[in-house]
Interface confidence: medium
């Protein structure tokens, strides 16, 4: 995350780390015990093997993501449709081996309702414990940063994104730049709060460079996704 | 959930199992037409800010809130299940109807042991003029950003 | 005000096991983890490890792994050491303390009031 | 794990001097702009008191004459002007990775 702030504890309790090899690679988002919504691109092969990844909830420091606090992934879904080209439908679901304990740190998200309304520069939030610059290195702690969505019309003009973004992605960030999500925070959360509760609008998923000006954050529109992802919870079930 | 799959038309539905597409009016209809059976297991949903329950109807060919009348909890639980949730039922609650909805699902008590939908009938009316806001998981509180002081 | 009050002082015969408590007062126990660190008289402090209330997941420094087991009762807000096997090198004052969990900046605002413990036949 | 290493052992300092305690760490404890060095005083019979955390944060209640600076594995304790009351055992803290570790302690003595 670039140009946030560090995360206090049980701020956001649906942020999980994914590591590969006691690596952090990617984010994700709790929404039940047992699943996490993550990015497409973060599961491509060969990582679309379970075995790979272990998540890490409610711990805000990479340092203290040791073995034996992770939970092992059973199940990796990537969305049918995902084309690794454009990004477009860039949404993967993870099964855990073990459900999560909730608690003050650990909690789920909501998934969107259908009906929800979103205001065009609607306040949300990003976090991740990716790069805090462009090029830059993993971020030992969670950050996380307001960003205003920002309307596809808008984010698809020709000194923007030039026609890129699909109805199955939302652009978020400021058009001067200085605020955005950045590589590693990839598969994590773009949350807002509605009715006093806080809700996954997004997942992030691409954007060229990170927090330049007219190049705001890409995201996953979860609003498209929510009935893909209850069929998947439903069939597993 | 807008039940327009890429390979049909604005009027069809698509059956995930096969991407075959399948008429509006047969979808929850108690009758599986595709072959997964996901016409039949896609019949609730939760709509809005509020966690609205609806259902769909096959007759209307659209999606109406359940009324409050005769609802509890075991009912809540079967829609949470029907959902994709397991085990993790939260709370079900009456909640004033603001949407001028004219046209409701109201619950046929008399039925017999079947999904939950099936239990359900076409109403234009709803005696508590109240209507279902389920939640199927505790979601979306985080611990206030204000910390106690030291 | 945050408090940490600990169990008082304990004579106990080699290869018993001891039990220390440390009540937790004056703020939410389940947002914050307690840590336990020993002090043998005269020396420095070594970290035994954790324990988060919110969850009750626990880390223990290696070195403790077998010898100190850390529980929490919410209900009453209490965290708990137990000392097993005891031995004339476990005679140190054991102290609670309390830390940020996850942002774990890992430093001690709040400390308990200590309890010595004697092994001695 | 990071080993700490404190100097000077013990040091006498007059009143009113300046007392400066190094703490040295066996690898960096600094990274995503933190440096994860706490300080602590401790005097007989009491438990450790927090003075400085993340190598130059001054808790709350702790008197200014107290300060800390440092990052990467060099980290200073200052206190200055020196006051009776600060007759103690200082101890340094890292927090980078598990387990945490504290550094031997130096005593602070009054001439």
């Known amino acids: 995350i670039v140009g946030g702030e560090s995360a206090l504890p049980g701020a956001w309790p649906w942020q999980v780390s994914l590591h590969v090899q006691n690596v952090h690679v990617c984010g994700g988002s709790i929404i039940t015990p047992e699943w996490i919504v993550t990015a497409a691109h973060c599961v491509e092969k060969p990582l679309n093997n379970p075995w790979h990844w272990t998540a890490f909830a409610g711990i805000l420091r990479q340092s203290f993501m040791f073995y034996g606090a992770g939970y092992q992934v059973e199940k990796v879904i990537s969305h049918p449709n995902y084309d690794s080209k454009t990004k477009n439908n860039d949404i993967a679901l993870m099964k855990l081996q073990k459900p999560l304990t909730f608690n003050d740190l650990v909690k789920p998200v909501c998934l969107p309702n259908p009906g929800m309304m979103l205001q065009p520069e609607q306040l949300c939030w990003i976090s991740g414990w990716g790069a805090t610059e462009e090029k830059g290195k993993t971020s030992e702690v969670l950050n996380a940063a307001k960003v205003l969505l920002i309307e596809t019309q808008r984010c698809n003009s020709r000194y923007v994104y030039d026609n890129l973004i699909t109805p199955a992605m939302i652009c978020a960030g400021f058009l001067q730049g200085n605020v955005d999500s950045c590589q590693g925070d990839s598969g994590g959360p773009l949350v807002t709060s509605k009715n006093n509760i806080w809700w996954l609008i997004g997942d992030t998923s691409w954007g060229s460079g990170c927090a330049k000006a007219y190049r705001p954050g890409v995201y996953g529109n979860v609003m498209v996704f929510t009935d893909w992802i209850y069929r998947q919870m439903r069939a597993d079930g | 959930w807008k039940f327009m799959g890429s390979k049909c038309s604005n009027s069809g539905i698509e059956c995930d199992s096969s991407g075959t597409c399948i008429n509006p009016s047969n979808w929850c209809d108690g009758v599986s037409h595709c072959p997964g059976g996901e016409d039949e297991n896609r019949c609730v949903r939760l709509y809005g800010p509020n966690f609205i329950l609806q259902v769909y109807s096959s007759q209307r060919k659209s999606w109406h809130p359940v009324c409050q009348d005769d609802w509890s909890e075991g009912y809540g639980r079967a829609a949470c299940q029907d959902m994709g949730y397991r085990n993790s039922f939260y709370s079900s609650q009456g909640i004033v109807d603001d949407s001028g909805s004219t046209s409701f699902m109201k619950l046929n008590t008399s039925a017999g042991n079947v999904d939950i939908y099936k239990k359900l009938y076409h109403s234009d009316a709803c005696s508590s003029k109240a209507v279902v806001s389920l939640r199927c998981i505790a979601c979306g509180v985080n611990l206030n950003s204000s910390r106690q002081s030291r | 005000q945050v408090q940490l009050q600990q169990s008082g002082p304990a004579l106990v015969k080699p290869g018993a096991s001891l039990k220390i408590s440390c009540e937790a007062s004056g703020y939410t126990f389940t947002y914050y983890s307690i840590n336990w660190v020993k002090q043998r008289p005269g020396q420095g402090l070594e970290w035994i490890g954790w324990?988060?209330?919110?969850?009750?997941?626990?880390y223990y420094n290696e070195k403790f792994k077998g010898k100190a087991t850390l529980t929490i009762d919410k209900s009453s807000s209490t965290a708990y050491m137990l000392l097993s096997s005891l031995t004339s090198e476990d005679s140190a004052v054991y102290f609670c303390a309390r830390s940020d969990y996850g942002s774990a900046y890992g430093y001690f605002d709040v400390w308990g009031t200590g309890t010595t413990v004697t092994v001695s036949s | 794990d990071i080993v700490l290493t404190q100097s000077p052992a013990s040091l006498a300092v007059s009143l009113g001097q300046r007392a400066t305690i190094s703490c040295r760490a066996s690898?960096?404890?600094?990274?995503?702009?933190?440096?994860?060095m706490h300080w602590y005083q401790q005097k007989p019979g009491q438990p450790p008191k927090l003075l400085i955390y993340?190598?130059?944060n001054l808790e709350s209640g702790v008197p200014a004459r107290f300060s800390g600076s440092g990052s990467g594995t060099d980290f200073t304790l200052n206190i200055h002007p020196v006051e009776e009351e600060d007759a103690a055992t200082y101890y340094c803290?890292?927090?980078?990775?598990?387990?945490?570790?504290f550094g031997a302690g130096t005593k602070l003595e009054l001439k």
């Open positions: 993340l190598a130059s």
């Open positions: 803290q890292h927090s980078r990775d598990l387990p945490l570790t």
């Open positions: 324990i988060f209330p919110g969850s009750g997941s626990t």
């Open positions: 690898k960096s404890v600094s990274t995503s702009g933190y440096s994860y």
